[in-house]
Interface confidence: low
């Protein structure tokens, strides 16, 4: 018996087609992805093949103005239109709190939404009961397939799930649910979830009875043969893991941003054992036409976005200096504003020992592309912010050793004075440079804001300590020459859309007046 699994993950609000790098579509003839194009390909496969499941492994939320405006209603509407069979909850589904998940998505979705390792308690337990499930048994042709969901246990540090959801260890939570499916005589089981490729592989290895793992969170691109676009494969598709009980378990992911549709064919024997698995992600490029009815619907929903981008988010009563003459040479107040917004967006009161789990931000000055003039009545709009942060990136959470941070700050000024983009703006950091010293030895003082303290204060950076830092995904991926970050990071979790982070902060503050306050000094 053969099953075709179509899968997406980490779509992050890319409802419209995008450029090859998943940013805003500029040249339509070269654009990719989007739900209208996805629908065309899915329908084509559904017509051609008998047993097809369309699954999503989480993080539909967050990433473009679509989410900022529609707050998840767009996800439910278009996933319903594509007739998804199931979705696993990702960490970003909690970005607007539990209410922001329940109302627009859980209550509106016509497909099951899954997670076995999220347990509700207190008053939320009855409110959310039945709106998401640990597993779902789906009829496919003459057979049944069990889908068990899972979500990153790090979600409380990555999003805003509140205090009434407990995120358990994935493997511990999945095993009893899989065992339950076995007692129900379900012998074909897919684990669908959002914890990253390393956890996906562990699930494949450790959870008895899981036949296939469909994952997300790490934006992993797997491919067998010559890849069709710029993404470099992390391994073959499917990636095969041998379980502790000796079975070959295929593990798949489909990169991110709706650029690819994962396509996996599984052959099961009569006992539900995987006999063979093969496939590849399908690049959703312009050779696949956009479905006209879905495209028309997208255009209808788009109107509200255009109106939103010119509305006032808040006011500034000072000039927001985002000029390259400032931000690539010295502390600039636009850099301070953005870093403060980045930290504010990551406030999660971890426990009594820590006022927050992260206190530091770094931001390449070259990523700040425009100032905002306060003389326009002080008005700040989404359009203004899109000029400051035009690349459609995310502000991510990483863990780095102090020694890596020291290298990053040396790199920040290794060729100072040439208006290059690697000069770092900061938050929760005090750095002093001596430019008379040779490159690689110019950082003379580097103090960082404590997190394990009731009154935050600055302490010298410790080389062997592990620190959490918020930074643009561009830096996490080694951009602007920050190869040491890419090579030495100990953990990397993708965060929220950059403009959204800053716009939310400005809306929250209402009036802003960021200063230059001595975060970066020269001796």
């Amino acid at each position: 018996w053969e099953l075709t699994i179509l899968h997406t993950n980490d779509v992050h609000s890319r409802l419209e087609q995008t450029s090859e790098d998943s940013s805003k579509c500029v040249n339509a003839s070269r654009c990719m992805g989007g739900v209208a194009r996805l629908f065309t390909k899915v329908q084509q496969i559904r017509r051609a093949e008998p047993n097809v499941l369309l699954l999503d492994a989480g993080d539909q939320y967050q990433g473009t103005i679509w989410f900022t405006v529609y707050k998840g209603a767009e996800v439910a509407h278009f996933m319903n239109a594509l007739r998804y069979d199931a979705m696993a909850l990702g960490n970003h589904e909690f970005d607007n709190g539990v209410e922001g998940l329940i109302e627009p998505l859980l209550k509106e979705a016509k497909f099951p939404i899954l997670s076995a390792n999220i347990k509700a308690k207190g008053p939320l337990a009855s409110q959310i009961s039945g709106l998401y499930l640990p597993y779902k048994v789906l009829p496919v042709g003459d057979e049944v397939v069990g889908i068990v969901g899972y979500t990153s246990k790090e979600t409380p540090f990555l999003s805003n799930p509140g205090t009434n959801l407990v995120f358990e260890d994935e493997i511990t939570a999945l095993q009893p649910e899989v065992d339950k499916l076995k007692t129900l005589n379900v012998n074909k089981i897919i684990a669908l979830g959002h914890s990253g490729f390393e956890t996906d592989k562990l699930i494949a290895q450790k959870v008895r009875g899981v036949d296939v793992v469909v994952g997300g969170h790490s934006n992993t691109f797997l491919y067998t043969g010559n890849p069709p676009s710029k993404e470099v494969p992390a391994g073959k598709y499917p990636f095969i893991v041998t379980s502790d009980d000796g079975r070959k378990v295929p593990v798949v992911q489909a990169y991110a941003f709706g650029k690819y549709l994962g396509y996996l064919k599984i052959e099961f024997d009569e006992r539900g054992n995987v006999i063979s698995s093969h496939g590849n992600p399908i690049l959703l490029n312009s050779s696949i036409p956009e479905d006209p009815s879905i495209k028309a619907d997208i255009n209808k929903w788009r109107i509200k976005l255009d109106n939103y981008s010119t509305q006032e988010l808040g006011k500034t009563i000072v000039y927001l200096d985002g000029s390259s003459q400032s931000c690539r040479f010295r502390e600039c107040n636009m850099g301070n504003l953005i870093c403060d917004a980045m930290i504010n967006n990551n406030l999660r009161h971890a426990d009594e020992m820590f006022w927050n789990h992260v206190s530091m931000c770094i931001l390449n000055g070259g990523g700040i592309r425009s100032p905002i003039d306060e003389r326009n009545n002080g008005t700040i709009t989404w359009e203004n912010l899109a000029a400051v942060l035009p690349f459609g990136g995310t502000f991510d959470l990483v863990q780095l050793k102090g020694s890596t941070l020291k290298k990053a700050f040396e790199h920040s000024v290794h060729r100072y004075g040439q208006s290059t983009g690697e000069f770092l703006q900061v938050g929760g950091i005090h750095v002093v440079y001596d430019l008379s010293r040779k490159p690689g030895d110019r950082v003379v003082k580097l103090d960082v804001l404590c997190t394990k303290c009731r009154v935050p204060s600055y302490d010298p950076l410790k080389m062997d300590e592990i620190y959490k830092v918020i930074l643009p995904n561009f830096l996490a991926n080694g951009g602007d020459g920050f190869q040491m970050i890419k090579d030495e990071l100990l953990r990397h979790d993708s965060g929220d859309q950059d403009i959204n982070v800053v716009s939310t902060y400005i809306s929250k503050m209402k009036v802003i007046y960021p200063a230059v306050e001595g975060r970066i000094k020269f001796s």
Epitope: D245, G246, R247, R271
Partner: antibody
Framework: DIQLQESGPGLVKPSQSLSLTCSVT?????????WNWIRQFPGNKLEWMGY???????NYNPSLKNRISITRDTSKNQFFLKLNSVTPEDTATYYC??????????WGQGTLVTVSA | DIQMTQSPASLSASVGETVTITCRAS??????LAWYQQKQGKSLQLLVD???NLGEGVPSRFSGSGSGTQFYLKINSLQPEDFGVYYC?????????FGGGTKLELK
């Protein structure tokens, strides 16, 4: 072509530790697959001892769990067997082999280890 | 642990004959079974995996069959180079275990 080669002392005293090395050429042990130790006793009985995976996880035969350790040196593309508190019953030919989701397709030529005072 | 029982323990046959070796698993191992050949002083060579798939370069006179708990290795028209010891092994779950071996000798 993939080749595996065992090396180590041929004679070990009782109560001491047995240490063997498997050197792999033609394939990186961090790429994929599981890297196993198997032994064959006099009289031909075969026993799977354990493996180390491409991503540095272990799985041991429960009959040896308290005595066995399999580690690796990725820079040398080698993996190692350490068996503690040996007795004459541990006298055997020790093989390293590449397995994984498949059976053992590639084997070393084997090395005889005698445990004797 | 899953026990693998091979029979017969030894077998004498002549060149050109057909022989069958049986392997029984103490529990269901589906098709996760391999057959190996070992010549004197050499390491094992994979003949069959997944109970029935011939390994690369293995002559077509060898064939594997069975699933669940009962498996067979058949050698048609024995050749001089076929004499040695044959082992079955399951890889359904750890610990992987081997059969006790079948010694195939020249009659």
């Amino acid at each position: 072509d993939i080749q595996l080669q065992e090396s180590g002392p041929g004679l070990v005293k009782p109560s001491q530790s047995l240490s063997l090395t498997c050197s792999v050429t033609g394939y990186s042990i961090t790429s994929r697959y599981y890297w196993n130790w198997i032994r064959q006793f006099p009289g031909n009985k075969l026993e799977w001892m354990g493996y180390i995976t491409y991503d540095d996880n272990n799985n041991y035969n429960p009959s040896l769990k308290n005595r066995i350790s399999i580690t690796r040196d990725t820079s040398k593309n080698q993996f190692f067997l350490k068996l503690n508190s040996v007795t004459p019953e541990d006298t055997a030919t020790y093989y390293c082999a590449r397995g994984g989701w498949d059976p053992f397709l590639y084997w070393g030529q084997g090395t005889l280890v005698t445990v004797s005072a | 642990d899953i026990q693998m029982t091979q029979s017969p323990a030894s077998l004498s046959a002549s060149v050109g004959e057909t022989v069958t070796i049986t392997c029984r698993a103490s529990d269901n191992i589906y098709s996760y079974l391999a057959w190996y050949q070992q010549k004197q002083g050499k390491s094992l060579q994979l003949l069959v995996d997944s109970a029935k798939n011939l390994g690369e370069g293995v002559p077509s006179r060898f064939s594997g069959s069975g699933s669940g708990t009962q498996f067979y290795l058949k050698i048609n028209s024995l050749q001089p180079e076929d004499f040695g010891v044959y082992y079955c092994q399951h890889y359904y779950g750890t610990p992987f275990t081997f059969g006790g071996g079948t010694k195939l000798e020249l009659k």
